[in-house]
Amino acid sequence: LKGQEFAPSHQQVYAPLRADGDKPRAHLTVVRQTPTQHFKNQFPALHWEHELGLAFTKNRMNYTNKFLLIPESGDYFIYSQVTFRGMTSECSEIRQAGRPNKPDSITVVITKVTDSYPEPTQLLMGTKSVCEVGSNWFQPIYLGAMFSLQEGDKLMVNVSDISLVDYTKEDKTFFGAFLL
Amino acid sequence: LKGQEFAPSHQQVYAPLRADGDKPRAHLTVVRQTPTQHFKNQFPALHWEHELGLAFTKNRMNYTNKFLLIPESGDYFIYSQVTFRGMTSECSEIRQAGRPNKPDSITVVITKVTDSYPEPTQLLMGTKSVCEVGSNWFQPIYLGAMFSLQEGDKLMVNVSDISLVDYTKEDKTFFGAFLL
Amino acid sequence: LKGQEFAPSHQQVYAPLRADGDKPRAHLTVVRQTPTQHFKNQFPALHWEHELGLAFTKNRMNYTNKFLLIPESGDYFIYSQVTFRGMTSECSEIRQAGRPNKPDSITVVITKVTDSYPEPTQLLMGTKSVCEVGSNWFQPIYLGAMFSLQEGDKLMVNVSDISLVDYTKEDKTFFGAFLL
């Protein structure tokens, strides 16, 4: 690219420059979950820590009631990791009895709710069958990608089974987004 | 957003503009690990390639002695993948003998060391039970998230067992960070 | 950072400023794959949706014939998730017969093709042994990292077995890149 292509006088015409430190950003970390009602056929949403420890929200990116609220339109990188842990899945127990089986599974979905659409939009899904041999198992599912979001959109993280989420450490289960 | 909100004269007051190509960035790739002493109860740190092949450091982001050194304060996206491989885990061998068992596991931790804080801070952890049926197993753990770092902070990647790390290919095991 | 370090007059000398919204970006989502010929010992490449649903390309980042075409040199964050699903792997069937076995595996590779270089470069690889106990299994492999790319470079996603890729939902299998 030629330097003159992006001289300030030219840029202001079609796309304002902005300081990177001024962009909406959030990194949320896990907290102990309280069982909550959720819609039939919709996985429950996790709630998050937004200001203690490693967690933060800045530049008008707000967290409230399980949602990250997008304060300005643009392209965002969104990510989450959920660490699950459980006892031996039913699947392997059934198998020992010699019967065919459908595996148990763990699923994470990053969901967008927008005022212009009557259904949540699933942006990212990580889903894994769990058919463990050992008596205790644990494993993370990581997701991350870029999406075009609108001012006012809300983001949440849904999981297939809230009781399997490892809420013990802020570095194991987290959720974040930042304007590119 | 209105163009005038971000006119250069306004921006300079509260947050300097900067060229994106001038930001600290690094992508490090795996090398063969030399066994090193590490403190009891602390996972060993990996060392990395920082200039050959796909690896690079730029704009004052330096790599030295297993650490990435943060040259300026700001919000960074930090990521790593470690590919592990091993023989059948003890866990499944024990299980075949009919005894209950605690699964083996593999763990990756991205750790921050700060001069002003006596303890390393675990930023990200990926941990997985390994109870494999087959005689040889291999799998990656991927981590990535955004953190607010201070000039002088040091980042490293720790693993539960350095002997299980796949060091054969630069695309399988890597570590990186960039200023947003 | 001191404001004057990045005053416009200084910046223009060595690195042009540019509006973030003007940077090349793409998020591609899975479509049903048509079986295609591929060279022996080379994994087949996936093709993608580039404009419907969550998918988009912008600012001269173009998708054509399985490739993302890089329109300008710079540092890019590149990511992909591929969700695989299959029936019980041969590996566990063999094991039941009491024979030692080499596990089946699933692999994703993000590959760069450069006109000036005869061989494709593997940028990222996620590979996992699959030795599942249950009759149906499914799991994602996620990859993401930063690379210095040149104008004209082409990116693709290769997989070990195209028939195991879950193409049913745009949030399960995807591929993206953006200029930092």
């Epitope: 609220l69 709710v113 659409y117 009557p118 | - | -």
Partner: antibody, heavy 116, light 106 residues
């Protein structure tokens, strides 16, 4: 059962402020967005604005922005509309609408007449 | 503002007829919505995202289109379908509705 119920005075004097309240039941308001839409006699539908109840973030129709205010009280499960400096042209049926993340639901509407 | 031009403004058809209403946006929109409003009642959502049938809506209603041109169809008109139908875009600010199409039975 999901319900939205608009309430408020049916008659407002010109130049005064029109105030309506929407009380919701059967769902958690903070999971959605709440809108006000009006329909003037013999005319089509006009979107006035919306609020994101969890944060209070609002968006308004630019043609009404100087006169309209939408607020919420999540503890009472209520959303309120205020329209200042009304004229006869603001005579309409005012609807409270839920959207986002759940199927759209409209209240039955509240007729407000602006007259001296 | 994004202008929504709906046509026709009214139509008369027989029971069992196929009825088609079109809506043109002054600029491209991603999502289009279709509502039914009966006299003295609130509008009811029929179609969202251009082609998705809202819950509980009979399958004789359908929607199609993308960009600027959208179509709403009743495959077999029924007496209870007598109403005014509105298109709406929810993307630009402000959200805007078409002027409505009044459907009557011959």
């Amino acid at each position: 059962q999901v319900q939205l119920q608009e309430s408020g005075p049916g008659l407002v004097r010109p130049s005064q402020t029109l105030s309506l309240t929407c009380t919701v039941s059967g769902f958690d308001m903070v999971d959605t967005y709440m809108h006000w839409v009006r329909q003037r006699p013999g005319r089509g539908l006009e979107w006035m604005g919306r609020i994101e109840p969890a944060s209070g973030h609002t968006k308004y129709n630019p043609s009404l922005k100087s006169r309209v205010t939408i607020t919420r009280d999540t503890s009472k499960n209520q959303v309120s509309l205020r329209l200042s400096s009304v004229t006869a042209a603001d005579t309409a049926v005012y609807y409270c609408v839920r959207s986002g993340g759940l199927p759209d639901v409209w209240g039955q509407g509240s007729l407000v007449t602006v007259s001296s | 503002d994004i202008q929504m031009t709906q046509s026709p403004s009214s139509l008369s058809a027989s029971v069992g007829d196929r009825v088609t209403i079109t809506c043109r946006a002054s600029q491209g929109v991603g999502y289009m919505y279709w509502y039914q409003q009966k006299p003295g009642k609130a509008p009811k959502l029929l179609i969202y995202g251009a082609s998705n049938l809202a819950s509980g809506v009979p399958s004789r209603f359908s929607g199609s289109g993308s960009g600027t041109d959208f179509t709403f169809t009743i495959s077999s008109l029924q007496p209870e379908d007598i109403a005014t139908y509105y298109c709406q875009q929810w993307e630009g600010n402000p959200r805007t509705f078409g002027q409505g199409t009044k459907v009557e039975i011959k």
